[in-house]
Amino acid sequence: FERTRSLQDPCSNCPAGTFCDNNRNQICSPCPPNSFSSAGGQRTCDICRQCKGVFRTRKECSSTSNAECDCTPGFHCLGAGCSMCEQDCKQGQELTKKGCKDCCFGTFNDQKRGICRPWTNCSLDGKSVLVNGTKERDVVCGPSPADLSPGASSVTPPAPAREPGHSPQ
């Protein structure tokens, strides 16, 4: 089959890193500088992605694979393939259209990216606040008030064993 295919289409013999050059009687020519072909039988080489501006090169382009970019310090990647770089903020902040803004009271962000999230409402689980929340940290919930009544044991029961093969979410 391969032999038949190559008789019909001489370009099918051109390996990755080359292209089938119509200007040279369909011989296999190496990809020009800063271009690549990741598969055989290509009639053109794709131009390499250039990591410019806030992008920086994570992986150099080769004759058979495209360059890969990440972001310069102070920025982080967004989207598949690091299609955009977004400004980092400090912990306790979120990025708005007007720049980095502190988290509103009752919310926190423990990362340099993403949005401020509400503190956990301990009372929904029948628990009390053990450690107050800050802009950078969520509240820490403690035992329920009933558990702290006089005579109640302070020893917590052992946690149930996890099913094998499941990682904690």
Epitope: P33, N34, T44, D46, I47, C48, R49, Q50, K52, G53, T57, N66, L78, G79, A80, G81, S83, M84
Partner: antibody
């Protein structure tokens, strides 16, 4: 090899929204940026904006408030919407594969003429 | 935005003779590792533009070797060593360093 084909109405009334779709064949829409570029009759080329297959967009500031580009990876298509059009938006509209996010347009559609007139 | 200026705007050439088009940018297009973010396109009559040169001097695959690009920083040149009848059309330079990418006003090459 990669081919791009623009489609959409050739006539749009002033103040309405121009809508075009670019269908990519002979290759996946993934892993590249995809741009719209226009050319008024007898004039030069103007880049309008790009979209990455993941949905990230960047627009020409001169058009930013009016232009929206979206992508449908399941159909291997991306689309342009330009709102509040005037006669100055009459142009041939090209879609193109953008190798670096605003650079080296290696593959172009054949272009479609959109006339803005009542 | 970066402004691109081409000269001449019209270029009559005899077949077999060389041709040269100049392009100047309002700021340097030289970026890391000596890469100039400048492309050259040819738009033949009634057709879409086609990429000829990228990175200032790299010929796109399949482009005849009579086309060459040179220059760095803000001054660039496209040369055709021997013009053929099929080379007629409008040549555009484009900067690809900053968003928005911007094109020169175009140089119309015609056969004498």
């Amino acid at each position: 090899q990669v081919q791009l084909q623009e489609s959409g109405p050739g006539l749009v009334k002033p103040s309405e929204t121009l809508s075009l779709t670019c269908t990519v064949s002979g290759g996946s829409i993934s892993s590249y940026y995809w741009s719209w570029i226009r050319q008024p009759p007898g004039k030069g080329l103007e880049w309008m904006g790009y979209i990455y297959y993941s949905g990230s967009t960047q627009y020409n500031p001169s058009l930013k408030s009016r232009v929206t580009i979206s992508v449908d990876t399941s159909k291997n298509q991306f689309s342009l919407k330009l709102s509040s059009v005037t006669a100055a938006d009459t142009a041939v509209y090209y879609c193109a594969r953008d190798q670096s996010g605003g650079g080296s347009f290696q593959h172009w559609g054949q272009g479609t003429l959109v006339t803005v007139s009542s | 935005e970066i402004v691109m200026t081409q000269s001449p705007l019209s270029l009559p050439v005899t077949p077999g003779e060389p041709a040269s088009i100049s392009c100047r940018s309002s700021q340097s297009l030289l970026y890391s590792q000596g890469y100039n973010h400048l492309d050259w396109y040819l738009q033949k009559p009634g057709q879409s533009p086609q990429l000829l040169i990228y990175g200032g001097s790299n010929r796109a695959s399949g482009v005849p070797d009579r086309f060459s690009g040179s220059g760095s920083g803000t001054d660039f040149t496209l040369k055709i060593s021997r013009v053929e009848a099929e080379d007629v059309g409008v040549y555009y330079c484009m900067q690809a360093l900053q968003t928005p990418p911007t094109f020169g006003q175009g140089t119309k090459l015609e056969i004498k």
